[in-house]
């Protein structure tokens, strides 16, 4: 089942997704798509990275974190009710069927009518799967498809739900995470 995140109309939504490069510079292509993760790739791609840069995006979608260190969390600017739905974060690890897929459900709430201090993000988040993997390969920079195949070993799964929006800063520790190397 998908992990749920919430945001209000007019605010920015934040969908966490992380991986740990096997070695500095061993970046892995990532795609974000609207809709559940299909067997391959991402459907309705909204943003994509290669082994170095963001190489495709649509308006209002960006990576605000340090994506070259594995923080590929998606920010959606100025959300509307139409942004509700499932989003797929896919870590495209080289090798047959090695990709890691994370489905995140975004629920958009109507904006509060009563005046209140503006909050940048207001959502309820649950811990997505935490995953650790083991890999192999030299420490030198290898990119653009030169990474070796990586054997994945799933370690743990869904944990307790976070309800306090003040814990948004802790999402680095609770986001969809894959560790390579």
């Amino acid at each position: 089942s998908e992990v749920e995140y919430r945001a209000e109309v007019g605010q920015n939504a934040y969908l966490p997704c992380f991986y740990t490069p096997a070695a500095p510079g061993n970046l892995v292509p990532v795609c974000w798509g609207k809709g559940a993760c299909p067997v391959f790739e991402c459907g309705n791609v909204v943003l994509r990275t290669d082994e170095r840069d963001v190489n495709y995006w649509t308006s209002r979608y960006w990576l605000n974190g340090d994506f070259r260190k594995g923080d590929v969390s998606l920010t959606i600017e100025n959300v509307t009710l139409a942004d509700s739905g499932i989003y797929c974060c896919r870590i495209q690890i080289p090798g047959i069927m090695n990709d890691e897929k994370f489905n995140l459900k975004l629920v958009i709430k109507p904006a509060k009518v009563t005046p209140a201090p503006t909050r940048q993000r207001d959502f309820t988040a649950a811990f997505p799967r935490m995953l650790t993997t083991r890999g192999h390969g030299p420490a030198e920079t290898q990119t653009l498809g030169s990474l070796p195949d990586i054997n994945l070993t799933q370690i743990s799964t869904l944990a307790n739900e976070l309800r306090d929006s003040r814990l948004a800063n802790d999402l680095r520790d609770s986001g969809a995470t894959i560790r390579i190397g």
Partner: antibody
Framework: QVQLVQSGAEVKKPGASVKVSCKAS????????MDWVRQAPGQGLEWLGY????????SYNQKFKGRVTMTTDKSTSTAYMELRSLRSDDTAVYYC?????????????WGQGTTVTVSS | DIVMTQSPDSLPVSLGERATINCKAS??????VAWYQQKPGQPPKLLIY???NRYTGVPDRFSGSGSGTDFTLTISSLQAEDVAVYYC?????????FGQGTKLEIK
């Protein structure tokens, strides 16, 4: 010390091609990307693309796609940038520049530049 | 493509005074902005990367700040050798793009 030494100035006619070389020394050639940037006379900087010598992977600016090809010769630690179907507005100084993960793929060492003049 | 817009185009500053150059991205680029210095007849030199990281050997009078869409290069006390053209670059997406340049001169 790191050095990038480029080939000499070129004068070409419209429609012709030019191939600029960039010989690297002082670092492991395959550990870094090689970017190419150009600067028209009195103008700003324009990124053409990059090549990763480790495996030959490339990324080109769409503006030049189909006209530009970047290659490397690992045995001589040399990068090449070929631009075809030259036009007068391709007149510029062409730079090669090294980029790597440590500086978030910004360009920390640059060649001296190669002046390409396109004139009939 | 992401458009980088620098201001001002030209900046006269007295020696010893502070110089501030701004760069605005057409969309958020996180912290992925670099600053380069270019003197006539020379290739650019990297000063700052990832918005605020000073490159090796760059004097500490140069500093960078900002995130998202708005970025600033500050020279705390202008020296004669700082006269040059300064460019911002976004290194977030492909194609990488540069600002149009700011010419820093002595007032």
């Amino acid at each position: 010390q790191v050095q990038l030494v480029q080939s000499g100035a070129e004068v070409k006619k419209p429609g012709a091609s030019v191939k600029v070389s960039c010989k690297a020394s002082g670092y492991t050639f395959t550990d870094y990307y090689m970017d190419w940037v150009r600067q028209a006379p009195g103008q700003g900087l324009e990124w053409l693309g990059y090549i990763y010598p480790n495996n030959g992977g490339t990324s080109y600016n769409q503006k030049f796609k189909g006209r530009v090809t970047m290659t490397t010769d690992k045995s001589t630690s040399t990068a090449y940038m070929e631009l075809r179907s030259l036009r007068s507005d391709d007149t510029a100084v062409y730079y090669c520049a090294r980029s790597g993960y440590g500086n978030y793929y910004t360009m920390d060492y640059w060649g001296q530049g190669t002046t390409v003049t396109v004139s009939s | 493509d992401i458009v980088m817009t620098q201001s001002p185009d030209s900046l006269p500053v007295s020696l010893g005074e502070r110089a501030t150059i701004n760069c605005k991205a057409s969309q958020s680029v996180g912290n992925n902005v670099a600053w380069y210095q270019q003197k006539p007849g020379q290739p650019p030199k990297l000063l700052i990367y990832y918005a605020s990281n000073r490159y090796t050997g760059v004097p500490d009078r140069f500093s960078g700040s900002g995130s998202g869409t708005d970025f600033t290069l500050t020279i705390s006390s202008l020296q004669a050798e700082d006269v040059a053209v300064y460019y911002c670059q976004q290194h977030y997406s492909s194609p990488s793009t540069f600002g149009q340049g700011t010419k820093l001169e002595i007032k």
